[in-house]
Interface confidence: low
Amino acid sequence: MMTGTIETTGNISAEKGGSIILQCHLSSTTAQVTQVNWEQQDQLLAICNADLGWHISPSFKDRVAPGPGLGLTLQSLTVNDTGEYFCIYHTYPDGTYTGRIFLEVLESSVAEHGARFQIP
């Protein structure tokens, strides 16, 4: 039985040209995290494998940085980066947990963070 829950940064916004940290946290389970996939709609952005570390998808390597922790940092944001992001936790023995984050990239100089986590 899957007992865990994923907390995420929820709906967040950031300014065009800036950076943002996407973070998820798996709680309420003792399952071992074997891999975390970060995806944007149907595209794989990055993988963090427990044994092998990080791999950034070649298409995003100039704008995506690993961390902090199991999170993902998006840089040089454009309006096209607006959309849903998913953290997919592969765990043993529970299976797969998925968290959703919606990012809105704003043209304006004022961007509010409606976040569960503190975003630097």
């Epitope: 794989l44 993988i47 044994d51 092998l52 791999h55 998808s57 298409s59």
Partner: antibody, heavy 119, light 110 residues
Framework: EVQLLESGGGLVQPGGSLRLSCAAS????????MSWVRQAPGKGLEWVSA???????YDADSVKGRFTISRDNSKNTLYLQMNSLRDEDTAVYYC?????????????WGQGTTVTVSS | QSVLTQPPSASGTPGQRVTISCSGV????????VSWYQQLPGTAPKLLIY???QRPSGVPDRFSGSKSGTSASLAISGLQSEDEADYYC???????????FGGGTKLTVL
């Protein structure tokens, strides 16, 4: 069971073309980088080409401009279009699945298909 | 000429421990992960080690991998006759943007 099955090999004249296929089953094909690796008779392994989950492509210098790797995720199939074939392209061609991503190695291999370039 | 250098041959007697080396440069072995493949006569290669020292399920713990700087090695302990095969190291080269293999080592069990 994870399986890769190559097809399309055969005898072709120098300058000719062939298209190899690799049918994948038993895993989520679209999530993995895939490669073609070849082995000339009595020789070692030579990596030919790779395609990532996001469509990014990498080729060995020896085949650049002649070979084209592609994938059809809806058909769970990997392809290698080989043009302007040369004698030195004679080899067994293996399709290989990455271990998560290409950098971690290739964890599943097909049994290979033989390409012979000869006049 | 392979980008990664392996000895062409190695040998040992049953029960012995043998080590096969793989030498590269900063752009490949030092900055990437090394994997090892076993190819029995007439068959397709099989992954033995990935991520420098990780063993896939089903591979006996007699096989172990390690990496230091620009070199890597595969160790086989308790050598058995069925270990007679060709062994290849492989890694990603960040300068070539290409996967590279060693030339292969033919292991003979005496």
């Amino acid at each position: 069971e994870v399986q890769l099955l190559e097809s399309g090999g055969g005898l072709v004249q120098p300058g000719g073309s062939l298209r190899l296929s690799c049918a994948a089953s038993g895993f989520t094909f679209s999530s993995y980088a895939m490669s073609w690796v070849r082995q000339a008779p009595g020789k070692g392994l030579e990596w030919v080409s790779a395609i990532y989950f996001d469509g990014s492509i990498y080729d060995a210098d020896s085949v650049k401009g002649r070979f084209t790797i592609s994938r059809d995720n809806s058909k769970n199939t990997l392809y290698l279009q080989m043009n302007s074939l040369r004698d030195e392209d004679t080899a067994v061609y293996y399709c290989a699945k990455s271990h998560t991503v290409l950098q971690y190695g290739m964890d599943v291999w097909g049994q290979g298909t033989t390409v012979t370039v000869s006049s | 000429q392979s980008v990664l250098t392996q000895p062409p041959s190695a040998s040992g007697t049953p029960g012995q421990r043998v080590t096969i080396s793989c030498s590269g440069v900063t752009s490949n072995i030092r900055n990437s992960y090394v994997s090892w493949y076993q190819q029995l006569p007439g068959t397709a290669p099989k992954l033995l080690i990935y991520g420098n020292d990780q063993r896939p399920s089903g591979v006996p713990d007699r096989f172990s991998g390690s990496k230091s700087g620009t070199s890597a090695s595969l160790a086989i302990s308790g050598l058995q006759s069925e270990d007679e095969a060709d062994y290849y190291c492989g890694t990603w080269d960040n300068t070539l943007n290409a996967w590279v293999f060693g030339g292969g080592t033919k292991l003979t069990v005496l």
